[in-house]
């Protein structure tokens, strides 16, 4: 019985891995989280290209649907506490004096999404965990 329970726990934990990636990617599209910083790699993503845009757009959140996420266990919509995420380490031209500050931000973000687990991903209020090796590894490059 105990073995079955442990197996079931593993299955329950594994069932939401793609949903976890899904929510993280949706958040990434809004907040432009530096997923590239999470992996110490220099390769460019196969299907992600840096955009020709050079403007540094601030991240703002509208009011029509943010703050709402559905929990995996119930049909209850929970508050999704969004802090205005700064896009860390933007490699934009000019203002080189900001490099140290950007490096600090990068370090904070780097811990957001690791293969061994998801912590501090900016999805406050969502207790996310992922022991899978198939975590989001989008190595999209910026300018």
């Amino acid at each position: 019985k105990r073995a079955v329970s442990e197996h079931q726990l593993l299955h329950d934990k594994g069932k939401s891995i793609q949903d976890l990636r899904r929510r993280f990617f949706l958040h990434h599209l809004i907040a432009e989280i530096h997923t590239a910083e999470i992996r110490a790699t220099s390769e460019v993503s196969p299907n992600s290209k840096p955009s020709p845009n050079t403007k540094n757009h601030p991240v703002r959140f509208g009011s029509d649907d943010e703050g709402r996420y559905l929990t995996q266990e119930t049909n209850k919509v929970e508050t999704y506490k969004e802090q205005p995420l700064k896009t860390p380490g933007k490699k934009k031209k000019g203002k080189p004096g900001k490099r140290k500050e950007q490096e600090k931000k990068k370090r904070r973000t780097r811990s957001a999404w690791l293969d061994s687990g998801v912590t501090g991903s900016g999805l406050e209020g969502d207790h996310l965990s992922d022991t899978s090796t198939t975590s989001l590894e989008l190595d999209s490059r910026r300018h």
Partner: antibody, heavy 118, light 115 residues
């Protein structure tokens, strides 16, 4: 209310280029990722491209990679799709779509028809 | 490969209920999907996202006649108290980010006829 209006479609010869536009209103355009999805006549939907809120990240399927470029001008609340080296199989209605925190394609435009024919 | 399979057509009587099925490829049976409605000559409309445990979140202005459920690799869209305007194509879709790529695929769609 959220409104997305596509334009720029038309008849174009194979190998030529075309640029589609999507004018957005009713929401803070610069806060959301945007996408293009197409539908060939009598066929199913196919995802074409996605761009992040500030335009720094773009994503494409293999079918259009290297030929299509998604971009945006947040000051004009406009999304673009630059289509180069067009092929007959690119003939479709092209829809722009807006994400939410919940899903990829929550709001859709009415579409613009692109016909690639000689 | 991420694949969604749908029956090409379905029919049900006005006022009745209908249950449409979207089947995920077996190795992706735990995935969250999305359901869309496309009325004739119109753009698609987002209906809901549907998780493996059957929980779902509906889009803006979607009546509660539309509900979702799950069993294994199958994802269901149930429409109750069918109305004439429910006659449309119903399409499921699924996205994933894996091996540094974002992919999104749609099912072929089910054409629903309201008798």
């Amino acid at each position: 209310q959220v409104q997305l209006v596509e334009s720029g479609g038309g008849v174009v010869q194979p190998g030529r280029s075309l640029r589609l536009s999507c004018a957005a209103s009713g929401f803070t355009f610069s806060s959301y990722g945007m996408s293009w999805v197409r539908q060939a006549p009598g066929k199913g939907l196919e995802w074409v491209a996605t761009i992040s809120s500030g335009g720094s990240y773009t994503y494409y399927p293999d079918s259009v990679k290297g030929r299509f470029t998604i971009s945006r001008d947040n000051s004009k609340n406009t999304l673009y799709l630059q289509m180069n080296s067009l092929r007959a199989e690119d003939t479709a209605v092209y829809y722009c779509a807006r994400q939410t925190t919940m899903t990829y394609f929550a709001y859709w435009g009415q579409g613009t028809l692109v016909t690639v024919s000689s | 490969q991420l694949v969604l399979t749908q029956s090409p057509s379905a029919s049900a009587s006005l006022g009745a209920s209908v249950k449409l099925t979207c089947t995920l490829s077996s190795q992706h049976s735990t995935y969250t999907i999305e359901w869309y409605q496309q009325q004739p000559e119109k753009g698609p409309k987002y209906l809901m996202d549907l998780k493996q445990d059957g929980s779902h979140s509906t889009g803006d202005g979607i009546p509660d006649r539309f509900s979702g459920s799950s069993s294994g690799a199958e994802r269901y869209l149930t429409i109750s108290s069918l109305q004439s305007e429910d006659e449309a194509d119903y399409i499921c879709g699924v996205g994933d980010t894996i091996k540094e790529q974002f992919v999104y695929v749609f099912g072929g769609g089910t054409k629903l006829t309201v008798l």
